[in-house]
């Protein structure tokens, strides 16, 4: 009886794993084996596919074959018993195009209100992604184990920290990789769960802001308790992208080591041009806080995006605010030749209820104020360019009293 050639051959490539699956064409014939040949582009001869010779099952692995993953190859299969079937040719394919990104490896660390996620490619030193290692981005889905309500976080790198979590709570997450340059989305990792710790005695510092004064950077933050010491560290932001290395060499800012105030001043020349991450930690001598949220700090933007300067003309029921260019050292105005929008926050001096106005114009009216009442105003500038989505720090607050009722305009 003539053997029929196998049909429906599927090629599955995940990272560097090459798997072939096929259907037997005749289930009734026993003790049949299967063999594959392959052919590279521009070659006439067929070569035996190692790992896929005389296979008794309907699956084989040819990962050991060192192929150029960008080069098209063709496969053929036949069945063998006493005689052989005719060859069945599989459509030619390019391994890289066909490959899927496998599940990444995930390593979790817990704090009281944060989880640190370290992500590595599933296959170490992968041949398939050798040229794309630094282009991987990841996305994750996270949920509280008790609720199952999912939150998606897109476009993260090999180290990501999720803040504002609840203490003593189990969170679960899964991560997948993407190569946006090749339109490839990977498969999810297994689900990993971790429990946040009991609440720490000392909270981390909050609301870290960087501003420029003269030739110095001024770093400010808020803290709940007095009589603390603080330290500040920095890291090159691009190091978060490094896929294989999870040793992050945070560096001290010398002028911000063991400072006793909630700010520190250091020369601009501490940092070369670039994008950095900054973090702050508090200590009371016995206990230490976890690190603050990491803020991104771009020396280029920081150098030119200064808080706006403004004047207030007070009326009985409104303020007119006139925004001018920020001043540099020596009181010279800074020319900012890119479009800005202004965020103006105002509040009654005796209340914490803030109201906000967003305005493109440099003359702004703050309406609906009460007569003879002290209001405070602060403002900051935002770039309108989407690629350069940056904000200045807030200006210092200016407080003014509105005029008595029915003041003429």
């Amino acid at each position: 009886k003539n053997l029929k050639s196998p049909q429906k051959v599927e090629v599955d490539i995940i990272d560097d794993n090459f798997i072939l699956r096929w259907n037997r064409s005749d289930e009734s014939v026993g003790n049949v084996t299967f063999s594959f040949d392959y052919q590279k582009t521009g070659m006439d001869n067929w070569i035996k596919l190692s790992g896929c010779q005389n296979i008794t099952s309907t699956k084989c692995n040819f990962s050991s074959l060192k192929l150029n993953v960008y080069e098209e190859i063709k496969l053929r299969i036949r069945a063998e018993k006493e005689n052989t079937s005719s060859w069945y040719e599989v459509d030619s394919f390019t391994p890289f195009r066909k490959a899927q990104i496998g599940p990444p490896e995930v390593h979790l660390e817990a704090e009281d209100k944060a989880i640190v996620i370290h992500i590595s490619p599933g296959t170490k030193d992968s041949v398939m992604w050798a040229l794309d290692g630094l282009s991987f981005t990841y996305s994750l889905v996270i949920w509280k184990n008790s609720s199952g309500v999912e939150e998606r976080i897109e476009n993260i790198y090999s180290r990501h920290k999720i803040y504002k979590l609840s203490p003593e709570t189990t969170y679960c997450l899964k991560v997948k990789a993407a190569l946006l340059t090749s339109w490839k989305i990977g498969v999810y990792s297994p689900v990993h769960c971790i429990k946040t710790t009991v609440e720490n005695e000392l909270p981390p510092p909050e609301n870290i802001e960087v501003s420029v004064q003269n030739q110095n950077y001024v770093l400010k933050w808020d803290y709940t308790y007095a009589n603390m010491t603080f330290q500040v560290q920095w890291l090159h932001a691009f190091l978060k992208r490094n896929p294989g290395n999870h040793l992050y060499k945070w560096k001290q800012i010398p002028d911000c080591e063991n400072v006793k105030t909630t700010q520190c001043v250091f020369p601009q020349n501490v940092f070369q041009k670039g994008i950095y991450l900054l973090r702050v930690q508090a200590s009371d001598g016995n206990n230490t806080s976890f690190w603050s949220e990491e803020i991104k700090f771009d020396t280029e933007i920081q150098a030119f995006l200064l808080p706006p300067v403004f004047n207030i003309r007070s009326l009985s029921d409104s303020f007119h605010i006139y925004i001018g260019a920020p001043k540099q050292s020596g009181n010279t105005p800074v020319i900012q030749d890119y479009p800005l929008i202004y965020e103006i926050i105002f509040w009654e001096n005796t209340s914490n209820a803030e109201r906000k106005i967003i305005e493109k114009k440099t003359d702004v009216t703050v309406p609906n104020l009460k007569p003879l009442t002290v209001y405070c105003v602060k403002a900051r500038a935002h770039t309108m360019d989407e690629k350069l989505n940056k904000s200045s720090v807030f200006s210092d607050a200016v407080c003014e009293k509105t005029k008595p009722g029915n003041t003429s305009k």
Epitope: E109, A110, I194, H246, T288
Partner: antibody, heavy 118, light 107 residues
């Protein structure tokens, strides 16, 4: 294969100085931290300090700030620990250790025994 | 500095038993804890990092657990070659401090 080869045992007089070495193979020390750890007989492990061989930045445990100096030579893939004004309290086994992923001490040298005696 | 306390200096166990070595931190260290094994006359060997992750090549009878201030290294099926001293270490605040060690004796 990752290996940390430490220099041989030292017998030195009180008041003298000594420099211990640790040569790494199987990895580039610039990509890691190199730590030194002290262990006295029947006592625990004490961290002396570390160096980032990439830029030479060092950090010491407070009690070793004056006593110890850690250096590194990236070109020979070697880290060093120098001790000054030795006393009998400094007699111990000293380990050099690689600070790997997530800051953990993943590979240890075989140790160097330092004896301080007149 | 953070103090790591291993309250049991010695523990006695038999081959095949399950034993738990404990370690307490003087403040919340998250999950930033490692465990090391030091056999007589040898240098320490890394077993567990980030409280619960085993290094490759470490037998799966070694399991780390805990977070915050309380940590445990469990050996589920003690073998004669597990005769050693076990140290915990915090790796969150420099200087990274070690526990005083727990010597495991096999009956």
């Amino acid at each position: 294969e990752v290996q940390l080869q430490q220099s041989g045992a030292e017998l030195v007089k009180p008041g003298a100085s000594v420099k211990l070495s640790c040569t790494a193979s199987g990895f580039n020390i610039k990509d890691y931290y190199m730590h030194w750890v002290k262990q006295r007989t029947e006592q625990g492990l004490e961290l002396i300090g570390r160096i980032d061989p990439e830029d030479g930045e060092t950090k010491y445990a407070p009690k070793f700030q004056v006593k110890a100096t850690i250096t590194a030579d990236a070109s020979s893939n070697t880290a060093y620990l120098q001790f000054s004004s030795l006393t009998s309290e400094d007699a111990a086994v000293y380990y050099c250790v690689r600070g790997g992923n997530f800051y953990y001490f993943d590979f240890w040298g075989q140790g160097t025994t330092l004896t301080v005696s007149s | 500095d953070i103090v790591m306390t291993q309250s049991q200096k010695f523990m006695s166990t038999s081959v095949g038993d399950r034993v738990s070595v404990t370690c307490k931190a003087s403040q919340n260290v998250g999950t930033n804890v490692a465990w090391y094994q030091q056999k007589p006359g040898q240098s320490p060997k890394a077993l567990v990092y980030s409280a619960s992750y085993r290094y490759s090549g470490v037998p799966d009878r070694f399991t780390g657990s805990g977070s915050g201030t309380d940590f445990t290294l469990t050996i589920s099926d003690v073998q004669s070659e597990d005769l050693a001293e076990y140290f915990c270490q915090q790796c969150i605040n420099y200087p990274y401090t070690f526990g005083g060690g727990t010597k495991l004796e096999i009956k």
